[in-house]
């Protein structure tokens, strides 16, 4: 029995080839311990700027100074490392810019050597120049989500430097990753800063974190591995997307849904609506409206853009993706604020992906 009543039906049309995506790395700012760091929020025309670190609101304190579009950290320590965001709240919309702060003795990543999959060359490191760990080749680490067919070999790399030479260890889902945790174990090639798992199976799915540390600091990086069984599979949606958003009346907002599907996916953006003053049909099922779907006349179905929003646009937006095998859907909420209230990026909480079995 259908779980909803469609207010606006759509027919399936030929769509664009499936998108295989990767998650990009935010810009990285490096500071040495004890130094001051100043970052300018790279957003234009900001009326109000709010800051977060690792998703938590950042306010001024004795070491953190927030002046206009600038964030200053005085006497930086490794604890200041993390993912920062500045949200510019304008009269009509809001925009968020993300960046990483890495408090380390490392020189800028522009001085990294080119990695040719061989051992990183640390011989030139001056033994007197003590350094906390730092990434030497962030390009090798940009692809965070790896969707790999079963039976393939997976290699995760975290090329790093430091003095003394850092050590590397690996966690799976936040816990120590032991050889006995998988049949056939795994290989760690310290000179390549890599973890290698051969012949992956579905139980290898999860988050893999490299922790690189020495006595001066610790850095880490997480990869997500999805093992695609060697049989047709349902669409996979990137966790955390679409993300909750807020804007003021008259503002614009975008929801993004990232899809991985070998089979041609059909993407629909759906919203709960009212019909004749009711949210539910005579059968007790909610009324849903298809706002956008992939097809010949639809550009970039992974993005739903709403312009000049009104209070009526507030609510839950569902990204529903189907292929001939099955479906997956995730949703996000739009909060529409009165014009005088400046919005901030909400904590990104989404419905659990339904593709997990």
């Amino acid at each position: 029995r259908p779980s909803f009543s469609l207010v606006e039906d759509t027919t399936l049309e030929p769509e664009e080839p499936p998108t295989k995506y990767q998650i990009s790395q935010p810009e990285v700012y490096v500071a040495a311990p004890g130094e001051s760091l100043e970052v300018r929020c790279l957003l234009k025309d900001a009326a109000v700027i709010s800051w977060t670190k690792d998703g938590v609101h950042l306010g001024p304190n004795n070491r953190t100074v927030l002046i206009g579009e600038y964030l200053q950290i005085k006497g930086a320590t490794p604890r200041d490392s993390g993912l920062y965001a500045c949200t510019a709240s304008r009269t009509v919309d809001s925009e968020t810019w993300y960046f990483m702060v890495n408090v380390t003795d490392a020189i800028s990543s522009g001085d990294d050597e080119d990695d040719t999959d061989g051992a990183e060359d640390f011989v030139s490191e001056n033994s007197n120049n003590k350094r906390a760990p730092y990434w030497t080749n962030t390009e090798k680490m940009e692809k965070r989500l790896h969707a790999v067919p079963a039976a393939n070999t997976v290699k995760f790399r975290c090329p790093a430097g430091g003095n003394p030479m850092p050590t590397m260890r690996w966690l799976k889902n936040g816990k120590e990753f032991k050889q006995e945790h998988r049949i056939g174990g795994y290989k760690v090639r310290n000179q390549h800063w890599s973890l290698i798992m051969e012949s992956v199976v579905p139980s290898d799915k999860g988050n893999y974190t490299c922790v690189v540390e020495n006595e001066y600091g610790s850095i880490n990086h997480t990869y997500h591995l999805d093992v695609v069984e060697r049989s047709p599979h349902r669409p996979i949606l990137q966790a955390g997307l679409p993300a909750n958003a807020s804007t003021v009346v008259g503002g614009d907002v975008e929801f993004v849904c990232k899809v991985y599907s070998d089979a041609q996916p059909h993407i629909q953006w759906i919203k709960h609506v009212e019909k004749n003053g009711s949210k539910y049909g005579p059968d007790g099922l909610p009324y849903l409206k298809v706002l956008k779907h992939s097809g010949i006349n639809s550009s970039n179905a992974e993005v739903l853009a709403l312009f000049n929003v009104t209070e009526a646009d507030a609510g839950e937006y569902i990204c529903k993706v189907s292929n001939y095998i099955g479906q997956a859907n995730q949703s996000a909420w739009l909060t529409v604020l009165p014009k005088q209230q400046a919005p901030g990026r909400e904590k990104e909480i989404t419905a659990s992906p339904d593709y997990l079995e």
Partner: antibody
């Protein structure tokens, strides 16, 4: 192992309706589409439609709209197809197949005859 | 609807032969194509998916190739159990559509 067990052969009169079943085991029934396919000597294989058991979403081949009705019961991991207003043209073997059309039921033979 | 033109409709071959069956779609189907084998009184059996991927348990003498709108199934070194009907299926767009089938007979 994955199995799709279909109901037995049917002999029905023209104008009647029939409801056949397909019981799934060995996988998470609700998270895979269930397809239905018709096989006749003259027409070969024809896709009738699909149902997504988790929410009851259906998609039909226009040719079979009004002829076939697909339903699913997640509590028993069983999919159903009802065929109405039967004629001799509906005599065929009907298969259910899991989402990727990778696993198929053994087929239900339908004969429409007076 | 996407039409799938399968050829030949029937063919004869000997044990040990190498044969090729083709399917042409009326538009680009981006490798969204499966191949099936069917024997009398049995349901179709899954051979190849996404045009080139061999399904679990299928002998390596079966292979799929193609892209765009043109696809083929090749069986090298034919064995006695390979004589059957073969169908292609496109799943790029609903309604899903099958080729008309190829009957492979022993010469």
């Amino acid at each position: 192992q994955i199995q799709l067990q279909q109901s037995g052969a049917e002999l029905v009169k023209p104008g009647a309706s029939v409801k056949m079943s397909c019981k799934a085991s060995g996988y998470t029934f609700r998270y895979y589409n269930m397809h239905w396919v018709k096989r006749t000597p003259g027409q070969g294989l024809e896709w009738i439609g699909l149902i997504y058991p988790d929410n009851g979403d259906t998609s039909y081949n226009q040719k079979f709209k009004g002829k076939a009705t697909l339903t699913a019961d997640t509590s028993s991991s069983t999919a159903y197809m009802q065929l109405s207003s039967l004629t001799s043209e509906d005599s065929a073997v009907y298969y259910c197949a899991r989402g990727g059309l990778d696993y198929w039921g053994q087929g239900t033979s339908l004969t429409v005859s007076s | 609807d996407i039409q799938m033109t399968q050829s030949p409709s029937s063919m004869s071959a000997s044990l040990g032969d190498r044969i090729t069956i083709t399917c042409q779609a009326t538009q680009d189907i981006v490798k969204n194509l499966n191949w099936y084998q069917q024997k009398p009184g049995k349901p179709p059996s899954f051979l190849i998916y996404y045009a080139t991927e061999l399904a679990e348990g299928v002998p390596s003498r079966f292979s799929g190739s193609g892209s765009g709108s043109d696809y083929s199934l090749t069986i090298s070194n034919l064995e006695s159990e390979d004589f059957a009907d073969y169908y292609c299926l496109q799943f790029y767009e609903f309604p899903l559509t099958f080729g008309a089938g190829t009957k492979l007979e022993l010469k």
